[in-house]
């Protein structure tokens, strides 16, 4: 806490500029008007203030806006954002995607901090749903964001937002999350033609039921083994040898290398040996 002291004669700040870096903490407190700071926040980032000086500037804004900063100030916080606590951020009402992007940029390349996590939560909750533009932005900065949501939270994501999802955004999702996302993806991509549809739906297939896998097997999709290995075991087990052969196409030979791993192992054990022999891979049921 900086003591309240009178501003020395001639030191009253008329604008936020580089001359302020030579001010001591108490001089900043006494000589910089909080309202001036708020209107010229965009200048702060261009000035090499010390962390201690930034603390003073934050303190001034806190006094001016005890109920939380307005978005006009938040948008221009820049590095001062790193000084905010999650409790500060909880008071904010951030509605502009541009503001969100500006603050995420400050933290770019770092792990998601508690401040950033709180900011994202406040923003998404304020929007009322995880729309496509928001998801696009969040996954660009944090590819793991989608898989950090619970299955219940994912259930509230509109199918239209699924267009923003890239394969790498689903890397850390578990089967229960894919169970929720797959039907949304199926709905989102339903008007695409066969080959384009498969390219889009492929990353979500860990949530696909047996009947959808059977349907795909009729479309010459040539699913790769990496995708096949991520399918639900209970969805793979009822597939016939002929259906798996059609589903995998030229990749069917890869079954041999995966014969000891689920779901391939369990599927092999469910098949008649005569049927397995038709593949010519030496698979033993």
């Amino acid at each position: 806490e900086v003591e309240k002291t009178a501003c020395p004669s001639g030191k009253k700040a008329r604008e936020i500029d580089e001359s302020l870096i030579f001010y001591k903490k108490w001089e900043l407190e006494a000589c910089v008007d909080a309202a001036l700071l708020a209107t010229q926040m965009d200048r702060v980032n261009a000035i090499p203030f010390t962390y201690e000086q930034l603390d003073v500037l934050k303190h001034k804004l806190d006094e001016l806006y005890p109920q939380g900063y307005p978005e006009s100030v938040i948008q221009h916080l820049g590095y001062l954002f790193l000084k905010m606590s999650p409790e500060d951020i909880r008071k904010w009402n951030v509605t502009s995607l541009e503001t969100l992007k500006a603050l995420l940029e400050v933290n770019k390349g770092h792990e998601m901090s508690p401040q950033v996590a709180t900011l994202i939560d406040r923003f998404v909750k304020g929007r009322g749903q995880l729309d496509k533009d928001t998801l696009d932005t969040l996954t660009a900065f944090y590819p793991g964001y989608l898989c950090s949501l619970s299955p219940e939270e994912l259930s509230s994501v509109p199918p239209s937002s699924i267009w923003a999802v890239r394969p790498q955004d689903l890397d850390t999702c578990d089967p229960r999350q894919l169970d929720v996302l797959y039907p949304k993806a199926r709905l989102a991509f339903q008007n695409m033609n066969g080959s384009e549809y498969f390219v889009k739906i492929q990353s979500f297939l860990g949530g696909a039921p047996t009947e959808d896998l059977k349907a795909l097997s009729q479309q010459n999709v040539s699913m790769d083994l990496a995708t096949f290995m991520k399918l639900r075991t209970d969805a793979v087990l009822p597939l016939t040898v002929a259906e798996v052969q059609k589903l995998l196409g030229p990749h069917v030979e890869g079954l041999k290398a995966e014969e000891r791993h689920r779901p391939v192992r369990d599927w092999i054990l469910r098949q008649r040996q005569d049927d397995l022999d038709t593949l010519g891979l030496g698979l033993q049921g």
Partner: nanobody, 123 residues
Framework: EVQLAESGGGSVQAGGSLTLSCTAS?????LGWFRQAPGKEREGVAI????????YYADSVKGRFTISHDNAKNTLYLQMNSLKPEDTAIYYC???????????????????WGKGTQVTVSS
């Protein structure tokens, strides 16, 4: 360390109403109520996600229980209407700061618990 302060609960006739409240000492990602009836598992009843603005309700309470919250006070309210004898249980406020993707009703993912408040509904 998140502290949870519960209030509300008590005894009521079937068809009556009660309101529970729970205040968290700091920001949490999920806050809500679980309940445990004698000889039964602890189950999620109504849980608010502060991450995405989604509220979970157990099927058995949908249309009867409603969550509301006061952001400024970090307080969550559970309005319980049309109470039934089978709603009798100890109600626990629970909170977590969780971004693992764990289910909202997975009680093992909640690391902060209130002491519990008894709700008794007689027929």
């Amino acid at each position: 360390e998140v502290q949870l302060a519960e209030s509300g609960g008590g005894s009521v006739q079937a068809g009556g109403s009660l309101t529970l409240s729970c205040t968290a000492s700091e920001y949490v990602t999920h806050l809500g109520w679980f309940r445990q009836a004698p000889g039964k598992e602890r189950e999620g009843v109504a849980i608010e996600s502060f991450r995405i603005g989604y509220t979970y309700y157990a099927d058995s309470v949908k249309g009867r229980f409603t969550i509301s919250h006061d952001n400024a006070k970090n307080t969550l309210y559970l309005q319980m209407n049309s109470l039934k004898p089978e709603d009798t249980a100890i109600y626990y406020c629970a909170a977590r700061q969780d971004r693992s993707g764990a289910s909202m009703v997975n009680r093992d993912s909640y690391n902060y618990w209130g002491k519990g408040t008894q709700v008794t509904v007689s027929s």
